[in-house]
C-alpha cells in the first residue's frame, strides 16, 4: 500500500484551512479521549479511479469521497482519518486530514475528496474514514467503513495499467486445445513480442471430479523475434488412464517485467459426452 | 443512451419460483457491478442482490440469501436474478441497477446507483 506520487496533497476548500499528513493510524484521541466528539462521516463513497505519475505510468487508486451531517457536532471536528486495509496481508496505510480552521455551516453540505491511495489489482480493501477526534470508549462510533474489491487484470480499464501491463496483462494468447488420436492433445497459442521462455502445464482430471489424475509440465524455449507474435504448437502425450478424460492447459509466461508471477491464461477441454444407448446385455451368462 | 429494461415479473403463488431479467444497452457493460433493489409497497428502497463485473464476487440480502439467485451474461448484456420459493413479503417492484463506480463493494453500492430500470412487479400470493 502506498500514496500515489509525494507531491503536495491538498484538502483545503473554500472556508476550510486543511493540510494531510501522514498518520500512524493511531491518533492521539484514542490515548486522551475527549468530552465531546464529532457525528460520523455520511455517505461513504468509493470509485476506482486512475492517475498517472509524474513519470507517466498510470495506477488505479481509490477515489473516497464523504460528507459531513449537518448537525452542530462539526464545530467539534478536527478533521478526520482516512485508513485503507488490504484484507489478504493485514497492511494499513493511514493519513489524516488537520483542520487549521474551524468548520462553519454554510449554504452547501460539506463533502471531502481523497484519490491518493494506490491499489492493487484484484485486491479487495476496507476503506475507512474517522472523524476526529475519535469517540471515548463507551461513545456511539463515529467512523464509516466499506469493503473495495478492485477489478482484476482481464477488466478492460485495468488491462492498461502499469502493474496489470507489467504482469503481461496485453498479451493475448488465444489459446486453442485439440484432442488428436493416441492419447494426445495439440495445444497452440500466439507468442509474445519478447524473447523469454514459456511453461506449458497440463492437468487432467476424472469426469465429475477435482482431484487430478494426471499432470505433465512441458518447456517452450525463448522463441526468436521472428517468431514472435507466430503460432506456436505442441503435442502433448497424454497418460492412457479410462475416465481421466478433462484436461485443463495453463500457459505460463517468464516475461522479463514479471519474471515467474506473470499472469497465466488457461483453456480447459472437457470430456466427451457419453452415449445414451444402455450397455448391450451378453446373449449368454458365462457360468465361470 | 444508458437503458435498463426489466422483465420477467407476474403474480406468483407462495413457494413457486419466478426469474427476472434485465437487459441492458448503451454502456460497457462487462466494466460494471450491477444490482437489484426491490420496493415493496409503501416501504422505502431494499437492497436485494449484487454481482461483480465478472461474477467473481456475489452478495445478498439476509432476507433472500439461500432463496435467490444472481447472475450475468456479458456477452448478452444481461443480468439475472432465479427467485425461487418466493413468500408473500417478497411482493415488490425489482428493479435493475447500475453501479456508478468500477469496482464493487460488498453489501451494496460503493457510490451511488447511477441509472435504473423502470421496474418489473413481482406479486406473491395464494
Known amino acids: 500500500l502506498r500514496l500515489l506520487d509525494h507531491r503536495a496533497l491538498v484538502c483545503s476548500q473554500p472556508g476550510l484551512n486543511c493540510t494531510v499528513k501522514n498518520s500512524t493510524c493511531l491518533d492521539d484521541s484514542w490515548i486522551h479521549p475527549r468530552n465531546l466528539t464529532p457525528s460520523s462521516p455520511k455517505d461513504l463513497q468509493i470509485q476506482l479511479h486512475f492517475a498517472h505519475t509524474q513519470q507517466g505510468d498510470l495506477f488505479p487508486v481509490a477515489h473516497i469521497e464523504w460528507t459531513l451531517q449537518t448537525d452542530a457536532s462539526i464545530l467539534y471536528l478536527e478533521g478526520a482519518e482516512l485508513s485503507v486495509l488490504q484484507l489478504n496481508t493485514n497492511e494499513r496505510l493511514c493519513v489524516r486530514f488537520e483542520f487549521l480552521s474551524k468548520l462553519r455551516h454554510h449554504h452547501r453540505r460539506w463533502r471531502f475528496t481523497f484519490s491518493h491511495f494506490v491499489v492493487d489489482p484484484d485486491q479487495e480493501y476496507e476503506v475507512t474514514v474517522h472523524h476526529l477526534p475519535k469517540p471515548i470508549p463507551d461513545g456511539d462510533p463515529n467512523h464509516q467503513s466499506k469493503n473495495f474489491l478492485v477489478p482484476d487484470c482481464e477488466h478492460a480499464r485495468m488491462k492498461v495499467t502499469t502493474p496489470c501491463m507489467s504482469s503481461g496483462s496485453l498479451w493475448d494468447p488465444n489459446i486453442t486445445v485439440e484432442t488428436l488420436e493416441a492419447h494426445q492433445l495439440r495445444v497452440s497459442f500466439t507468442l509474445w513480442n519478447e524473447s523469454t521462455h514459456y511453461q506449458i502445464l497440463l492437468t487432467s482430471f476424472p469426469h465429475m471430479e477435482n482431484h487430478s489424475c494426471f499432470e505433465h509440465m512441458h518447456h517452450i524455449p525463448a522463441p526468436r523475434p521472428e517468431e514472435f507474435h507466430q503460432r506456436s504448437n505442441v503435442t502433448l502425450t497424454l497418460r492412457n488412464l479410462k475416465g481421466c478424460c478433462r484436461h485443463q492447459v495453463q500457459i505460463q509466461p517468464f516475461f522479463s517485467s514479471c519474471l515467474n508471477d506473470c499472469l497465466r491464461h488457461s483453456a480447459t477441454v472437457s470430456c466427451p459426452e457419453m452415449p445414451d444407448t444402455p450397455e448391450p446385455i451378453p446373449d449368454y451368462m458365462p457360468l465361470w | 443512451e444508458v437503458q435498463l429494461v426489466e422483465s420477467g415479473g407476474g403474480l406468483v403463488q407462495p413457494g413457486r419460483s419466478l426469474r427476472l431479467s434485465c437487459a441492458a444497452s448503451?454502456?460497457?457493460?462487462?466494466?460494471?457491478?450491477m444490482h437489484w433493489v426491490r420496493q415493496a409497497p409503501g416501504k422505502g428502497l431494499e437492497w436485494v442482490s449484487g454481482i461483480s463485473w465478472n461474477s467473481g464476487r456475489i452478495d445478498y440480502a439476509d432476507s433472500v440469501k439461500g432463496r435467490f439467485t444472481i447472475s450475468r451474461d456479458n456477452a448478452k448484456n444481461s443480468l439475472y436474478l432465479q427467485m425461487n420459493s418466493l413468500r408473500a413479503e417478497d411482493t415488490a417492484l425489482y428493479y435493475c441497477a447500475k453501479d456508478m463506480g468500477l469496482g464493487y463493494c460488498s453489501g451494496g453500492s460503493c457510490s451511488h446507483f447511477d441509472h435504473w430500470g423502470q421496474g418489473t412487479l413481482v406479486t406473491v400470493s395464494s
Open positions: 448503451g454502456f460497457p457493460f462487462d466494466d460494471y457491478a
